[in-house]
């Protein structure tokens, strides 16, 4: 006869491990007992369980409540046992010793490998600001056994660096993603991807990039100066900028207070029917936590009558 077992049994932390040991004997041979022991190198054998043909299953005190026989139907030549709720400390070498009649004793060893799936964590780096050099965007750490693989999935251009720390029964891997911040990266996903044999599928943690910036400010509304004449209604100036975080807007008049009746509505300055009092230099002040910008324009409200007089004069002068 001969013993059938596995060289390696792999199980995920918390799952039940089946330790196989099957005696393939000749007809008429009987198994008297199967003794299981843990036999790690450098340590004495530690008894695990005994499957006895007459007495049944004995579980040694160290494994009380954790070792069972596989569910029926059971073959009397099958000495396999189930180790319930495998923990990392269970990883190691195991031996089954089978006492048979009349063939004698046989033994076989297997290695139990307990996979510890990682629980990854992603930590964003310091606040990203346009104009910075190479900056840490995020770091991702995962600890497991064996060491997990940590990679990045993103459209953003950057560089990665990884380091590993070995512990007694596991390894922690940290990967960092560095980039040169630019406003085009705003809102882009940066995904940490963790692979491990104990995971059914890769674990992914996504971080949305936020890059602080403030664009140059400009004012729209004066494209056609001829529209800015006395009596015109609905005239307005709009301040144009963009930023992260979204900026706030403030309007002032350089050469005095804002005229009465002028309405400030965020980025827009609304005028009542135009008078010459509305002529002046207007300043749009744009700011966010990152920076501030100014843009100024000169409003010159035309008097159509003065204009026509001038034209006549000009004509007559010619």
């Amino acid at each position: 006869g001969e013993l059938e077992t596995s060289d390696v049994v792999t199980v995920v932390l918390g799952q039940d491990a089946k330790l196989p040991c099957f005696y393939r004997g000749d007809s008429g041979e009987q198994v008297g007992q199967v003794a299981w022991a843990r036999v790690d190198a450098g340590e004495g054998a530690q008894e695990l369980a005994l499957l006895h043909s007459k007495y049944g299953l004995h579980v040694s005190p160290a494994y009380e409540g954790r070792v069972e026989q596989p569910p029926p139907p059971r073959n009397p030549l099958d000495g396999s046992v189930l180790l319930r709720n495998a923990v990392q400390a269970d990883e190691g070498e195991y031996e089954c010793r089978v006492s048979t009649f009349p063939a004698g004793s046989f033994q076989a060893r297997l290695r139990l490998r307990v996979l510890v799936p990682p629980l990854p964590s992603l930590n964003p780096g310091p606040a990203l600001e346009e104009g910075q050099g190479l900056t840490l965007a995020a770091s991702c750490t995962a600890e497991g056994s064996p060491a997990p693989s940590v990679t990045w999935d993103t459209e953003v251009k950057g560089t990665t660096s990884s380091r590993s720390f070995k512990h007694s029964r596991s390894a922690a891997v940290t990967s960092e993603f560095h980039l040169v911040p630019s406003r085009s990266m705003n809102g882009q996903p940066l995904t940490c991807v963790v692979s491990h044999p104990g995971l059914l599928q890769d674990q992914r943690i996504t971080h949305i990039l936020h890059v602080s910036f403030l664009a140059e400010a400009s004012v729209r509304g004066l494209e056609d100066q001829n529209l800015w004449h006395i009596g015109r209604e609905g005239a307005m100036l709009k301040c144009l900028s963009e930023g992260q975080p979204p900026p706030s807007y403030n309007w002032t008049r350089l050469d005095g207070p804002l005229p009465s009746g002028v309405r400030v509505d965020g980025d827009t300055l609304g005028f009542p029917p135009l008078t010459t009092e509305h002529s002046g230099i207007y300043v749009c002040h744009v700011s966010n936590e990152f920076s501030s910008r100014d843009s100024q324009v000169t409003v010159d409200v035309l008097d159509p009558q003065e204009d026509s007089g001038k034209q006549v004069d000009l004509v007559s002068a010619s």
Epitope: Q33, L50, H52, K54, Y55, G56
Partner: antibody
Framework: EVQLVESGGGLVQPGGSLRLSCAAS????????MSWVRQAPGKGLEWVSV????????NYADSVKGRFTISRDNSKNTLYLQMNSLRAEDTAVYYC???????????????????WGQGTLVTVSS | DIQMTQSPSSLSASVGDRVTITCRAS??????LAWYQQKPGKAPKLLIY???SLQSGVPSRFSGSGSGTDFTLTISSLQPEDFATYYC?????????FGQGTKVEIK
């Protein structure tokens, strides 16, 4: 025929010592685990100690640990129990017994006691 | 330690009676249980091992059953030589422990 014969019992004062012997015959002594079991007058059975054939595994009941020592001489087919610091509650008939040898190389379990000696009485009294 | 509780502690019966003695373990012991018979002034004698296996030379009127925590010794037809004290013993763990005994007396 399997035979186990105990000797060495007697009257001893509290704190005294006694050495019991058990002569075995009719079987291959060096193949079997051997135990001592005692029985106080009018009481039930209490396991005392066990020793494996090579002497590499020994165990004791908590009540005698540190006071009693089990040993064996396979060349003489003899089992011993050295009893020190004896107390009144150690008064009992002491039996040596052979363990049934149907469990191989597994120390966490004991096996039934299939042969017993006739016993020797130990009386601890002042 | 595993506690073994026998019941009854004593019983009176007549020759030819069917006698049942029970033994309960404080935790599961599979079939690691033996039954012994002891007569006054004599050493115990192994009757049953592995809960239900009859020791060589023991009359077939003795039988054992049970597994886990509850066990039974049955004498199918009590004979005069069967009046004695009976002990159960677990050998699942060290120390092996005995029940307190059941004395079978003549009615």
């Amino acid at each position: 025929e399997v035979q186990l014969v105990e000797s060495g019992g007697g009257l001893v004062q509290p704190g005294g010592s006694l050495r019991l012997s058990c002569a075995a015959s009719g079987f291959n002594f060096s193949d079997f685990d051997m135990s001592w079991v005692r029985q106080a007058p009018g009481k039930g059975l209490e396991w005392v100690s066990v020793i494996k054939p090579s002497g590499d595994y020994i165990n004791y009941a908590d009540s005698v640990k540190g006071r009693f020592t089990i040993s064996r001489d396979n060349s003489k087919n003899t089992l011993y129990l050295q009893m020190n610091s004896l107390r009144a509650e150690d008064t009992a008939v002491y039996y040596c017994a052979r363990e049934y040898s149907d469990v191989v190389d597994y120390v966490s379990v004991r096996t039934p006691l299939d042969y017993w000696g006739q016993g020797t009485l130990v009386t601890v009294s002042s | 330690d595993i506690q073994m509780t026998q019941s009854p502690s004593s019983l009176s019966a007549s020759v030819g009676d069917r006698v049942t003695i029970t033994c309960r373990a404080s935790q599961g012991i599979s079939s690691y249980l033996a039954w012994y018979q002891q007569k006054p002034g004599k050493a115990p004698k192994l009757l049953i091992y592995a809960a239900s296996s009859l020791q060589s030379g023991v009359p077939s009127r003795f039988s054992g059953s049970g597994s886990g925590t509850d066990f039974t010794l049955t004498i199918s037809s009590l004979q005069p030589e069967d009046f004695a004290t009976y002990y159960c013993q677990q050998h699942y763990t060290t120390p092996p422990t005995f029940g307190q005994g059941t004395k079978v007396e003549i009615k």
